[in-house]
Interface confidence: low
């Protein structure tokens, strides 16, 4: 159980990406921008990338930056699971993995991250602008969801290397220690953007939400920003979402887990489990859906399959105690 604010060292770029000099210049501003937008705030990161080998094949990687034990992960597309999204996969640490077409392979990468490969062919294949969401439920952190999509201008296989961000901690001192670096990074980012403003650059995806709910809602909500946390997702292009998937969902509870082989249930264990906690760097936006209850005039939360979330029995704080130590 980690008890202090930590800023993991930046990982080296993924193999095959470090060779392009010009690409590094392109990636750096987005790494910085991601840090500026998400530093110290989101609990979940999402990375969406299109495979260079199969242009219509997607890989979604998601991770949880909490310290508790993950009870369940739900991956959906077309928006958050409870807001019109369709479940692609459900991963349970002990009971195994269940996935629905076009999901081809869902797996645990570490104790706190998963990956999902989507099949590219057929009517149910995703579009480049499809939103993918990952919802992690753990004790004691609660439920956290983040969404991401491929930027319109992204080149296949060229998504930036996942970059660890500062972890949201109960102790603010560590985060404040990082803030100076981030401030410098943000200033440097603005400088870079001004220098390279003649270049077309990929954009973060503000269009996925309604105008009054900017991406900045990934920040830990203050009283003033709570309203933004509850703004429903705007409707996105649904032509990429299969109409038949909904019928495949199990309902009425987790009875379907019983049929899963137990050998499929194990996640990687050991000291490396927390070593790799990347966040999306290029184009994949991060959002956190924390206000999970219906307010006046809002829909009550609903998450699709009967067993989809294990939110926080404690309530608000994500990082306080040694409750869910693996």
């Amino acid at each position: 159980m980690r008890t202090e604010a930590q800023v993991p060292a930046l990982q080296p770029p993924e193999p095959g990406l470090e060779g392009a000099m010009g690409h590094r210049t392109l990636v750096l501003p987005w790494v910085l921008l991601t840090l500026c937008v998400t530093a110290g705030t989101p609990e979940v990161w999402v990375q969406v990338r299109m495979e260079a080998t199969e242009l219509s094949s997607f890989t979604i990687r998601c991770g949880f930056l909490g310290s508790g034990s993950i009870s369940l992960v739900t991956v959906s597309w077309g928006g958050p699971n409870g807001a019109g999204g369709t479940t692609l996969a459900v991963l349970h640490p002990e009971r195994g993995i269940r996935q629905w077409a076009p999901a081809r392979q869902a797996r645990w990468e570490t104790q706190s991250s998963i990956s999902l490969i989507l099949e590219g062919s057929g009517a149910s294949s995703p579009c480049a602008n499809t939103t993918f969401c990952c919802k992690f439920a753990s004790f004691p952190e609660g439920s956290w969801e983040a969404c991401g999509s491929l930027p319109p201008s992204s080149d296949p296989g060229l998504s930036a290397p996942p970059t660890p961000a500062p972890i949201l901690r109960a102790d603010l001192a560590g985060i404040l220690g990082v803030s100076g670096v981030l401030l410098f990074g943000c200033v440097y980012l603005l400088h870079l953007l001004r220098r390279h403003k003649h270049r077309p650059a990929p954009r973060l995806q503000p269009s996925r939400t309604s105008p009054q709910a900017p991406r900045a809602r990934a920040w830990a909500p203050s009283q003033a920003s709570q309203a933004a946390l509850h703004v429903p997702y705007a409707t996105i292009n649904t032509s990429c979402r299969p109409a038949t998937l909904d019928t495949a969902h199990p309902h009425g509870g987790p009875s379907w887990w019983a049929s899963l082989p137990t050998h499929a249930a194990h996640r990687p264990q050991g000291p490396a489990a927390w070593a790799s906690t990347p966040i999306p760097a290029r184009g994949s936006f991060v959002s956190v859906e924390n206000g999970l209850y219906a307010q006046a005039g809002e829909r009550p939360p609903h998450t699709g399959p009967g067993l989809t979330l294990f939110p926080d029995p404690r309530g608000p704080r994500a990082m306080e105690g040694p409750l869910g130590v693996r």
């Epitope: 709570q226 209850y293 939360p301 029995p313 608000p316 704080r317 306080e320 409750l323």
Partner: antibody
Framework: QVQLQQSGAELARPGASVKMSCKAS????????MQWVKQRPGQGLEWIGA????????RDTQKFKGRATLTADRSSSTAYIQLSSLTSEDSAVYYC?????????WGQGTTLTVAS | QIVLTQSPAIMSASPGEKVTMTCSAS?????MHWYQQKSGASPKRWIY???KLTSGVPARFSGSGSGTSYSLTISNMEAEDAATYYC?????????FGGGTKLEIK
Amino acid sequence: QVQLQQSGAELARPGASVKMSCKASGYTFTDYWMQWVKQRPGQGLEWIGAIFPGNGETRDTQKFKGRATLTADRSSSTAYIQLSSLTSEDSAVYYCATFNNYLDYWGQGTTLTVAS
Amino acid sequence: QIVLTQSPAIMSASPGEKVTMTCSASSSVSYMHWYQQKSGASPKRWIYDTSKLTSGVPARFSGSGSGTSYSLTISNMEAEDAATYYCQQWISNPYTFGGGTKLEIK
């Protein structure tokens, strides 16, 4: 609208057991932990434990371990707490509560009176 | 077990008055949460993460503190604020509440 409707007042003898219920509506019952909190007359609040109805996973405190049993019925969206080996110290109002992040919902409470 | 001690146990304030109540923890906690409970009613979470107001809580309420010392402040007391306020920590099991501060209106 989220609602937690708790069962009515209970009167029990020392040494007996009692089972109180909390029926949830207005949200997906299986997706949220249900807490149980005790409040003795004129006193403060005491956290008993929590259950996740989706799989029956529970968290409890050492004080109530073995004596408080938390269960949930998904079909009726109802959570239960069973207290055994009752003593006068168990006379209290018992609240169920489901909360996550920025909002919380509580039942109206069930008053348990243990008397001979 | 972390013991939370609230003071004063009972206090009264006039409308418009500034009110501050404290919660002292027996060992350091990262965040404190506050609940409001009116007579005969269920508790409501009022402030979470030390200083964030739950939706619907008036802006005259504020929370602050760190380590072992936390406080809840009402900048301008109003009649509807009369209630008992409990602090709570979620850092270690058992997740203890303070004994409460009963705030009355003069």
